[in-house]
Amino acid sequence: EGAAQPNNSLMLQTSKENHALASSSLCMDEKQITQNYSKVLAEVNTSWPVKMATNAVLCCPPIALRNLIIITWEIILRGQPSCTKAYRKETNETKETNCTDERITWVSRPDQNSDLQIRPVAITHDGYYRCIMVTPDGNFHRGYHLQVLVTPELTLFQNRNRTAVCKAVAGKPAAQISWIPEGDCATKQEYWSNGTVTVKSTCHWEVHNVSTVTCHVSHLTGNKSLYIELLPVPGAKKSAKLY
């Protein structure tokens, strides 16, 4: 029951300084722009997992702003009308249509920086974001399928005779649970309206030489293991240890 490991190549430039929120960005610095220009334009769509409650910066294609006519950000979120944020260089005006989420803004003035920021990322920000840059040489697109990751809350307890329950509560996507040693297990998933999933794995060990069991939770936000000693007393509970 091994879970897929996070693709760390997508977790670029994530940092945590002082008490500020962690920031994620797929933007390239200026040195990379010229050498990767054609490569970036070919990679029209990027799947991007981002942790909830962090800050995210989404970038337009690396086009020099002096060549620009119009920049448009198109934002399609589940269950909402499409939102567009547009900037016309000639008249220096910005226009927004159906954009109600104040956490999604231009990084700064669009004539200086065309990037979009989400401060902070919420579970409702799952969706598709596309930057369209209109230039005299044609239109250039860059799209992001933003997948908001929610770290599940973990609990492990013994609830009856030689039986332990490991729960990964309200994670996104669903966590995967495995046990050491393997036992006789039943796993249930509970889907919540906000898109998170609670995974509950209950395991029973018939053999008595199993005294300590480990629940391993695999998730895109990181993996954790909890362990517990199986108590001989029916009905007694003992809290888990994390390592």
Epitope: R160, N161, D184, A186, T202, C203, H204, E206, V207, H208
Partner: antibody, heavy 120, light 108 residues
């Protein structure tokens, strides 16, 4: 073929003991699951008697049968046994064995049943 | 000790009719409930595990629902071959796996 085959019918006198066997075949007789015993008196419902851990030999008996029932296993012959002592007429019933994975696959395989008649 | 109370004890039903049998536990058993069908002179046959999961080979007209203390077995369109006694069983704790009293379903 995956099956549980039980011993034949028995007639016993009150106060005697009876030992019913249940032989597993077609699957591994190893740790991880239990063998349970359930009985059914004529025209009555099902009654859980207890179970034995195949790997550990751990025993769980229903309170009603404590002190009168003994469950054992013989891993070399893939057989479990249920012995009931101090028989009385109300112990007349069909006795079933059943394979039991406690959570993932509970009570998923049953023996054909053994009729035990207690009569003077 | 967890006690399972099954109702009704008896039901006489015409073919194609819907049958509902309930099972109530004296305390919460989460979803650890089984439903069986037993025909005369046969061993019990497992229909549903974990309150709502159909056992392999069981027709889809059978369904189970509930969790905690209240559970239901539904036969959506009764067929003649469904005449039998139906039992619920708790498997919440390895130390006690008691059955409900049974519900006899007869075809009119």
């Amino acid at each position: 073929q995956v099956q549980l085959v039980q011993s034949g019918a028995e007639v016993k006198k009150p106060g005697a003991s009876v030992k019913v066997s249940c032989k597993a075949s077609g699957f591994s007789f190893s740790s991880g699951y239990y063998m349970a015993w359930v009985r059914q008196a004529p025209g009555q419902g099902l009654e859980w008697m207890g179970l034995i851990g195949v790997g550990s030999g751990s025993l769980w008996y229903a309170q009603k049968f404590q002190g009168r029932v003994t469950m054992t296993r013989d891993t070399s012959t893939s057989t479990v046994y249920m012995e009931l002592s101090s028989l009385r007429s109300e112990d007349t019933a069909v006795y079933y064995c059943a394979r039991h994975f406690a959570l993932s696959d509970p009570f998923n395989l049953w023996g054909q049943g053994t009729l035990v008649t207690v009569s003077s | 000790e967890i006690v399972l109370t099954q109702s009704p004890d008896f039901q006489s039903v015409t073919p194609k009719e819907k049958v509902t049998i309930t099972c109530q536990a004296s305390e919460s058993i989460d979803s650890y409930l089984l439903w069986y069908q037993q025909k005369p002179d046969q061993s019990p046959k497992l229909l549903i595990k974990q309150a709502s999961t159909l056992a392999s080979g069981v027709p889809s007209r059978f369904s189970g629902s509930g969790s905690g203390t209240d559970f239901t077995l539904t036969i959506n369109s009764l067929e003649a071959e469904d005449a039998a006694t139906y039992y619920c069983q708790n498997y919440y704790d390895i130390s006690s796996n008691d059955f409900g009293g049974g519900t006899k379903v007869e075809i009119k």
